[in-house]
């Protein structure tokens, strides 16, 4: 355990005034695993003045950090870069004269307590005021700063000229684009202090490059991948006081592909499972032994899971017999193209013959099969149907 501190498997606490600590507590090698530390409590440590960049990085599981009634004057900008689990920070009654939002912008903090610090009134701390106003909870902290006359000003009353939140404005064409094409987004930012501008593209797969000047920027996305459909692209303006972002959703249109089609499996019903990708939503059509298969209450398409542009489902068959053995072909089609795949299905052998003995599929046409195509979804008219035991998509998503 660090000198002058006590430890458990998940907690470090250093609260004795004397002799106290002069640096942020670090665990000795071969002691408690720092990744398991979820709370560090420091109090009455007047000679602890700095949190350096690498002081806290080992404590990746840290959730609560308390440094109170101590001498903390400076926190390095990247001090908490590796501590993405931090939720509560309490720096009550220290010696902080300034604190940048850069310390905390990547954290999802539910609590940041800064009461009792001798902040200097400047634009550097305006973000704290903005944060307080955004919270507008009854337990708002009583924060003050010292002005040029060394007078204590409530942070709530702080007015600094040319010190406000920035704005971002994304000028985007219609962000519906065909797979393989390219697109350019433009963004302008404004604010005082002049904001930095950056693009947040998340996990965009398509190749992209940006050009950014001070207040203008463009993002060029080339050879757009269908995997990027539905992804959000944001232009972010950031300055000392805070940030603003403008976002658009990318819609990629592409021809259908049947990525999965398998032999039937039996559960409550028989199911020929498939996965189809495509945007706009492809229309599905089944063929049986080369002829159009018109669906009925005994044989119909069910979509169980829709994942944006990907559809997982079954051709569901109620109690199929040897009469249903044969080749099943799925065709998926939209305005950008089509795809088809075929499987052979064997449900049962001919009566009186060993199962699987007859390799020739019967040349049977179902009496009630018509020629209607099926757009994705359960299109069966169920007005007279007995309640089914099938597992349909109960998420309420549009198929």
């Amino acid at each position: 355990c660090p000198t002058s501190c006590k430890c458990s498997a998940s907690r470090i606490w250093c609260s004795d005034p004397s002799p106290g600590i002069v640096a942020f507590p670090r665990l000795e090698p071969n002691s408690v695993d720092p990744e398991n530390i979820t709370e560090i409590f420091i109090a009455n440590q007047k000679r602890l003045e700095i949190i350096n960049e690498d002081d806290v990085e080992a404590y990746v599981g840290l959730r609560n950090l308390t440094i109170v009634d101590s001498g903390l004057k400076f926190v390095a900008h990247k001090a908490f870069l590796k501590n993405s689990n931090l939720q509560h920070i309490n720096f009550t009654r220290n010696k902080l004269t300034s604190l940048s939002r850069k310390h905390f912008r990547h954290l999802d903090l539910s609590e940041l307590i800064l009461v009792g610090n001798p902040f200097t009134c400047s634009c550097d701390i305006m973000w704290i005021k903005t944060l307080q106003e955004a919270k507008s909870s009854p337990d708002t902290q009583d924060l003050y700063c010292l002005n040029e006359s060394s007078k204590n000003i409530p942070l709530a009353n702080l007015q600094i000229p040319n010190c406000g939140l920035p704005s971002a404005n994304l000028a985007a064409p219609n962000l519906t684009v065909e797979e393989g094409k390219s697109i350019t987004l433009s963004c302008s930012v404004a604010g005082d202090p002049v904001p930095n501008m950056y693009w947040d593209v998340g996990n965009l797969v398509s190749k992209h490059m940006n050009e950014t000047s001070h207040t203008q920027g463009s993002l060029r996305i080339t050879n757009i991948s269908s995997d990027d459909s539905g992804k959000q692209i944001s232009c972010v303006a950031e300055n000392l006081v805070g940030e603003d972002q403008d976002s658009v959703n990318l819609t990629v249109h592409f021809a259908p592909t049947i990525t999965f089609l398998e032999s039937p499996t039996s559960d409550h019903h028989w199911c020929i499972p498939f996965t189809v990708k495509g945007n706009p939503k492809p229309a599905l059509q089944w063929f049986y032994n080369g002829a159009i298969l018109n669906e009925s209450k005994y044989i119909c398409t069910k979509i169980h899971v829709t994942n944006h542009t990907e559809y997982h489902g079954c051709l569901q068959l109620d109690n199929p017999t040897h009469m249903n053995n044969g080749d099943y072909t799925l065709i998926a089609k939209n305005e950008y193209g089509k795809d088809e795949k075929q499987i052979s299905a064997h449900f049962m052998g001919w009566p009186g013959i060993d199962d699987g003995a007859n390799p020739n599929y019967p040349d049977v046409i179902y009496e009630d099969y018509g020629t209607a195509a099926n757009d994705i979804g359960d299109t069966t008219n169920r007005s007279n149907e007995i309640p089914s035991t099938d597992v349909t998509d109960k998420t309420g998503r549009e198929h």
Partner: antibody, heavy 116, light 106 residues
Framework: QVQLLQSAAEVKKPGESLKISCKGS????????IGWVRQMPGKGLEWVGI????????RYSPSFQGQVTISADTSISTTYLQWSSLKASDTAIYYC?????????WGQGTTVTVSS | QSVLTQPPSLSVSPRQTASITCSGD??????VSWYQQKPGQSPVLVIY???KRPSGIPERFSGSNSGNTATLTISGTQAMDEADYYC?????????FGGGTKLTVL
């Protein structure tokens, strides 16, 4: 070497005020807590409170809160313990203590006698 | 405020081991210091942070602390060790002393 030199013994009447002192030398006075400890005749040690001279942050033990005032003057490396109105029960030896390694340096003690 | 409890007195023969206990709720979660006070003298720190010895304190003085009990051990007790011993811990930011143990070397 590190030393704490306390003021001389005091004899006072109930209701009078008093300020005793403790001067530090041989170390960075402002950078270490200084504590005051009471020992009543024939009794054990009791913490009165502590002060951090650099910013005058002061903590009192609950039983002494509002009864005494601890202060410090960093310009002369001295800390004080004072009473505005003494009582007979304040009769005791008062020690100041400080140091770089816990409270490893103690003053010689100041005997305060309050008697009518 | 927490309470630290010590036995009022303890007698030990020379060269024997003396163990003075100090108990308090979850005391093992706090650091304990031990002070020696001889008649007419100021207290002297003999152990701090449970187990550490300030320079100048003989090796026969050692300390431990776990659970609800801290212990000051004097191995090979000498006549000069006869004194009052006080344990001390911090409760938030105020110090708390035990009632003291009078060690008599027979």
């Amino acid at each position: 070497q590190v030393q704490l030199l306390q003021s001389a013994a005091e004899v006072k009447k109930p209701g009078e005020s008093l300020k005793i002192s403790c001067k530090g030398s041989g170390y960075r006075f402002t950078s270490y807590w200084i504590g005051w400890v009471r020992q009543m005749p024939g009794k054990g040690l009791e913490w009165v409170g502590i002060i951090y001279p650099d910013d005058s942050d002061t903590r009192y033990s609950p039983s002494f809160q509002g009864q005494v005032t601890i202060s410090a003057d960093t310009s002369i490396s001295t800390t004080y313990l004072q009473w505005s109105s003494l009582k007979a029960s304040d009769t005791a030896i008062y020690y100041c203590a400080s140091g770089e390694v816990a409270f490893d340096v103690w003053g010689q003690g100041t005997t305060v006698t309050v008697s009518s | 405020q927490s309470v630290l409890t010590q036995p009022p007195s303890l007698s030990v023969s020379p060269r024997q081991t003396a163990s003075i206990t100090c108990s308090g709720d979850k005391l093992g979660d706090k650091f304990v210091s031990w002070y020696q006070q001889k008649p007419g003298q100021s207290p002297v720190l003999v152990i701090y942070q449970d187990t550490k010895r300030p320079s100048g304190i003989p090796e026969r003085f050692s300390g431990s602390n776990s659970g609800n009990t801290a212990t000051l051990t004097i191995s090979g007790t000498q006549a000069m060790d006869e004194a009052d011993y006080y344990c001390q811990a911090w409760d938030s930011s105020t110090g708390v002393f035990g009632g003291g143990t009078k060690l008599t070397v027979l």
